[in-house]
């Protein structure tokens, strides 16, 4: 089968600081040296890009400076962290992997990770 399978967890709960981490793992049909990883958010059948990074195998994942994502790679596994999340950002986050080089190109799309974000309760003022 000429297809690339991408696995990611079904559900992740963001921390109280609005940080969510999950692993995106892909079964590579070829020996790629250049890989692009994109995180997409799907809400009401609308898909928007959250962040993207291209990396050379063996090198670190580098997102843009203003990106809300960070990540590390190890073989065919990418550890993704999304920060600055709020309750309104709760939704399905899809990991998309593209084997860019060498040919042939392969596309892999995960089933998505449902990230739940709960805004922390504000601390009550304390009287001393």
């Amino acid at each position: 089968c000429k297809a690339m399978h991408v696995a990611q967890p079904a559900v992740v709960l963001a921390s109280s600081r609005g940080i969510a981490s999950f692993v995106c793992e892909y079964a590579s049909p070829g020996k790629a040296t250049e890989v692009r990883v994109t995180v997409l958010r799907q809400a009401d059948s609308q898909v928007t890009e959250v962040c993207a990074a291209t990396y050379m195998m063996g090198n670190e994942l580098t997102f843009l400076d203003d990106s809300i994502c960070t990540g590390t790679s190890s073989g065919n596994q990418v550890n993704l962290t999304i920060q600055g999340l709020r309750a309104m950002d709760t939704g399905l986050y899809i990991c998309k992997v593209e084997l860019m080089y060498p040919p042939p190109y392969y596309l892999g799309i995960g089933n998505g990770t449902q990230i739940y974000v709960i805004d922390p309760e504000p601390c009550p003022d304390s009287d001393f």
């Epitope: 089968c1 399978h5 250049e34 291209t54 593209e98």
Partner: antibody
């Protein structure tokens, strides 16, 4: 709104060159792979070439490899197809298309006709 | 290269009838990477279905896609006058990107 507009088609003699352009608007051009697809009169769709994101990675269909060059200028939101050594069987309507977030070709231009004839 | 074969070549039906179009792949295609397009004369193709079964934005629910492996189907539950056109299936999971030869749905 999201739009692709091709230009540059015309009638050209075999062996000559032509450059097609595709102007994009309404979306972040550099975030998408862009394809050229052609359709010879009365036939189906034939994929021609793709260029990804920053423009470093390109792929071509075998019939055009070595003759056609795909490029993009992200600062101008424009995709190009330089067609050299044109042959009769390159006669077709040429479409540019965007590779959507989930991979399918979700936005298409209206097409530009290229006729190779002596 | 993955070869896609569509059948029938032409489908002659009346408005209100159900249309069933087939697309068969020469090797297994992940359902995540199969699309259907509609093309009317003198117009560009329009994305109808992606991921074998998900409708693109603005596509009416009379269009549905199904299938997996090597066999995929596009169904139009009740043909409207504007549905008479040519339909193409396409795989986009690996290069080269390939399409079927098309099925023409014409008015009987």
């Amino acid at each position: 709104q999201v739009q692709l507009v091709e230009s540059g088609g015309g009638v050209v003699q075999p062996g000559r060159s032509l450059r097609l352009s595709c102007a994009a608007s309404g979306f972040t051009f550099s975030s998408y792979g862009m394809h050229w697809v052609r359709q010879a009169p009365g036939t189906g769709l034939e994929w021609v070439a793709v260029i990804w994101y920053e423009g470093r990675n390109k792929y071509y269909a075998d019939p055009v490899k070595g003759r056609f060059t795909i490029s993009r200028d992200n600062s101008k939101n424009t995709l190009y197809l330089q067609m050299n050594s044109l042959r009769d069987d390159d006669t077709a309507v040429y479409y540019c298309a965007r590779a959507g977030d989930l991979g399918a070709f979700d936005i298409w231009g209206q097409g530009t006709m290229v006729t190779v004839s002596s | 290269e993955i070869v896609l074969t569509q059948s029938p070549g032409t489908l002659s039906l009346s408005p209100g009838e159900r249309a069933t179009l087939s697309c068969r792949a020469s090797q297994s295609v992940s359902s995540s990477y199969l699309a259907w397009y509609q093309q009317k004369p003198g117009q560009a193709p329009r994305l109808l279905i992606y991921g074998a079964s998900s409708r693109a934005t603005g596509i009416p629910d009379r269009f549905s896609g199904s299938g997996s492996g090597t066999d995929f189907t596009l169904t139009i539950s009740r043909l409207e006058p504007e549905d008479f056109a040519v339909y193409y299936c396409q795989q986009y999971g690996s290069s080269p990107w390939t399409s079927g030869q098309g099925t023409k749905v014409e008015i009987k």
